[in-house]
Every structure is written in structure tokens, then in C-alpha cells.
Interface confidence: low
Amino acid sequence: KEVCYERLGCFSDDSPWSGITERPLHILPWSPKDVNTRFLLYTNENPNNFQEVAADSSSISGSNFKTNRKTRFIIHGFIDKGEENWLANVCKNLFKVESVNCICVDWKGGSRTGYTQASQNIRIVGAEVAYFVEFLQSAFGYSPSNVHVIGHSLGAHAAGEAGRRTNGTIGRITGLDPAEPCFQGTPELVRLDPSDAKFVDVIHTDGAPIVPNLGFGMSQVVGHLDFFPNGGVEMPGCKKNILSQIVDIDGIWEGTRDFAACNHLRSYKYYTDSIVNPDGFAGFPCASYNVFTANKCFPCPSGGCPQMGHYADRYPGKTNDVGQKFYLDTGDASNFARWRYKVSVTLSGKKVTGHILVSLFGNKGNSKQYEIFKGTLKPDSTHSNEFDSDVDVGDLQMVKFIWYNNVINPTLPRVGASKIIVETNVGKQFNFCSPETVREEVLLTLTPC
């Protein structure tokens, strides 16, 4: 079957849209009237209250839309709505760093139904966004390369459809945990893929299989750059008990959403935080997350590391290839940004069994204490570890060392760190030395060698 609409063209239930393994039922999208796609414009001039706009000259001219600014569309996913706080929060953070037309796309008319139907309705949403982009180009000479479409869940595939319909001329699409069911393993025509825009970046946060883990997001790479924070499957802070999950810092409703789909929602929270942390989400190229956590992918290569989220487009090699995979760790609550350091400690003093911790002090801030090694502490041995600090300490000025004995030792042995090397993710090294040794639980300050 096929259904046609005046502005948007025709929609078929032929393969690959339906009748394939991943979507066996022949279902057509609802009509544009029923999906009721709305465009809610926020700008630096109206950051708190949207202006509803349409692909119409008088509507755009009568709004705060500025043709000399970039335009970022934000498309929500299944069950969600364009007026939900998270979309406006993305806009508000954008206004802190740039002048921009921030358009929240509401399609709750088509998202609040069964998942299979909603997954077809995104074709209408994508067509509406494409129509809007093409209208801006024809009416105002506005270049599609100045358009960035950000889509969460089903919204990521709606963004892909908008990009496909504009022949890949859109400047950038960001997929925030693109939805898995009905999309994973499907032909590129159906889902978000790298040909949908000049640059496609993706954040995967809920990549466990839908069975048995109820993971709503794709594990499949679908962009030029695909980021897998915390491995892309289980996000820190998402396994809280039910009560603490629901009574969330952001309120009961956000907590209820988190309880139901915490990993899946993390993607837009990471993106929101990334806007105001331009270097807090460095993604490391790596064979897998297991290899990353084994400390084998540090520091960044000579070409640098891309930033997951808003600043991914600053990466020089962003379109060198498709399906480039990057790994990183985040925090367990906002602020999610983290800065990774490698610390190597050369020991001095007595041989004991215990563990050593180091804290960093720099021109931008100080870190907590992080454990570097646990086991036999032998003089002249060197132990290395990597950790993710919730503080960007900047240029290192000093480090502090402390050690703890694993046994009660009446002889009060003394241990020191003759040298500590701290390496930042860009490969910058700072060397600190001390000739002293200290008893357990006593801080030792090391200064530049």
C-alpha cells in the first residue's frame, strides 16, 4: 500500500519500510495531521518561552529566527514530547556558548502510541523537518550545511530520514542513543546512517539487546563517529534503588523517567553537559571497552581525541571514515564530564603490603585521591593506573601521595614516592619528585623535579 500527502510526498509499506525480519508487519505512518509535527523555536532572545513557527515566510519573519545563525533542531523519541524539559535544557546550555536558532520538534501526536507504529511515524517527522530545511533554503537562501539535527531514540532515525530526504546536505546529525527495535540491522534507507548528513555523530548508552536486557538503544555503529560512554550498555548511576531513582535531584517526573529508561535517557544528559564542558568528554579510539578499561588506549593519538557530544565536530578526522569507535567514562550524575589522567608512581622506602593513592593539584583545580596500586609495595618498583577525575586540574603544579598498610605493623615502616609522572589525555607529562618517606596515612607532597 501507499499513501501520499501534498507537501511531503508518498509513503509506502513496501520493503524495507515493512515486511522485513526486523519489521514484519506492513504498517503505514499516520497522516501529517495526526502526527502533528510542531516546531518550537527558542533563541538567545527568548530562552525561556518558545515561539511556535512553521515553514512559512511570515511565520519565520515574525519570529526571532535569525538567518545569520546556525539552526539546531532537537527531536524527541518514543512517548516523549517537544515541551519536555530536557529539550529546552539543551537549548539553554547552547545559549551559554553561542547564538543559535534552537528548534524543539514536537511530534507527541505520533510518539504516544505503540512502538511499532511510532517507528513508522518518524518517517513523517523526518519529512516535516526536511520540508522545513528546504523551505529555509528556498525562501531565505539558508544553507542546509548550517543545520544540525539532534535526535534522541526514535528521533535519531527521524533525523536520519530528514537527512536522507535532503540528500545528505544537512551539516550535521547527532544521534542520541538511536532506537534499536525495528532499526538495528535494517538497510541504511530505514535508519540513521553516515550518508544522512555531512557529519553524523552518535552516542550509545543503552546498547544491551532488547532481549533479555530491555536495552532500547542500538549497539550497531551508524555514524562517522560512534561514542560508547562507559561501554555503551550500563551507565553509572542507573542502578540505584527504586525510591532514590524516582525521588531524583531533577524532580519526581524526571526520576520516574529515569527509573523506566535510565540508560536510554543518559545520552541526552551527556550531550547537555558536553555543551558547557568543551574538553570533558574525550573519546579514546580503542578496540573495545574492555581494552579501554585495561588502560591500553591512553593517551590520545597524535590526531587527538574527539569530544563526545556538542564539540564532536571539532575533531579533525571526523569524516575520515565511517563507524569510528570511541570509548570514555563519565560520572554517575550531572556534571557527567570527566578528565582522564595516567599516573605512574616509583616507590621508595620499605617493602610492605598495602595500597597507594595520589591526588592532583593544578592551576584549574584539585582532584580527589585516586588509588594507583594495591599489593606489594617494593622500593624502586613503578606502578601505573588511569583514572577519571571529576575536576580538570589544568597544568599540574603539585601531587600528594598517601599509602595505607594492609596489616597492623608495630615497626611503623616508611614508604615514599621518589617520582610521580602524571600524563594528561593529550600526552602532556608532568614530573614530580621527593626524597622523603612517610608513615602510613601521612600525606607526602611532591613538587616538580
Epitope: 514484519p24 512517548i79 505503540g114 512502538y115 511499532t116 507504529q117 527495535p181 532500547f216 523506566a260 529508561a261
Partner: nanobody
Framework: QVQLQDSGGGLVQAGGSLRLSCAAS????????MGWYRQAPGKEREAVAR???????SYADSVKGRFTISRDNAKNTMYLQMNSLKPEDTAVYYC??????????????WGQGTQVTVSS
């Protein structure tokens, strides 16, 4: 009152078949995801198969090709057709309904369980 009534379990020989049924009250049958879980003695409950409201199915690797999940919207009933049963399929099977992932009325609902025993 939301209710899930699962039935159809029993004793069957290896290689045999069973069909489990899960009758749901109307309000919960409209749930986006429904599925079957099982729990063998001394083991954790594990997902066996799921089906979306639109009919998209997915299966655990251990049952792929042997089990088929389906739902009859007119009868508000979900089924699990189990063929080529093996002794390791022995477990209590539970029917599950899960509301849309971020619907305000989201919830997880379970049947009381039906015993499936496969003898060798």
C-alpha cells in the same frame, strides 16, 4: 485491577511441545512490551522471549528456532509455543507485561507462574 494469568505448563518428554498462554486484563494488554521469563531452581530469572505491541519479536539465544511468541489482540492473550523441548528448559515460566518505556504509568506486571518440566 491489573492481572496476568499464565497457564499451559505441565510435564512433557524431551523433544515434545507445549503451548503457554497468558491472559491479560485489557488495560495491561495494551502494554508496549510483553514477554515470557523463566526461573529454574537455584537460578536467576531470565528472559526467554518478548513481543512488542506491533508484533516485533525477539528471543534469547538458547530458545531461538524452537520457541515462538505471539499475541492475539482480540483475545487479550499472549502465547509461547515451545517445540523440541530439552531438559534444560525445565523451569517456572512467568508472563510479563511492561508499560511503554517512559510512560507516566509505567510498570512491570507478572503472572503467577506455570511449571514446565521436561523429562529425559
Amino acid at each position: 485491577q491489573v492481572q496476568l494469568q499464565d497457564s499451559g505448563g505441565g510435564l512433557v518428554q524431551a523433544g515434545g511441545s507445549l503451548r503457554l498462554s497468558c491472559a491479560a486484563s485489557g488495560s495491561i494488554f495494551s502494554s508496549d512490551l510483553m514477554g515470557w521469563y523463566r526461573q529454574a531452581p537455584g537460578k536467576e530469572r531470565e528472559a526467554v522471549a518478548r513481543i512488542t505491541r506491533g508484533g516485533t519479536t525477539s528471543y534469547a539465544d538458547s530458545v531461538k528456532g524452537r520457541f515462538t511468541i505471539s499475541r492475539d489482540n482480540a483475545k487479550n492473550t499472549m502465547y509461547l509455543q515451545m517445540n523440541s523441548l530439552k531438559p534444560e528448559d525445565t523451569a517456572v515460566y512467568y508472563c510479563n507485561a511492561r508499560r511503554s518505556n517512559y510512560d507516566r504509568s509505567w510498570g512491570d506486571y507478572w503472572g503467577q507462574g506455570t511449571q514446565v518440566t521436561v523429562s529425559s
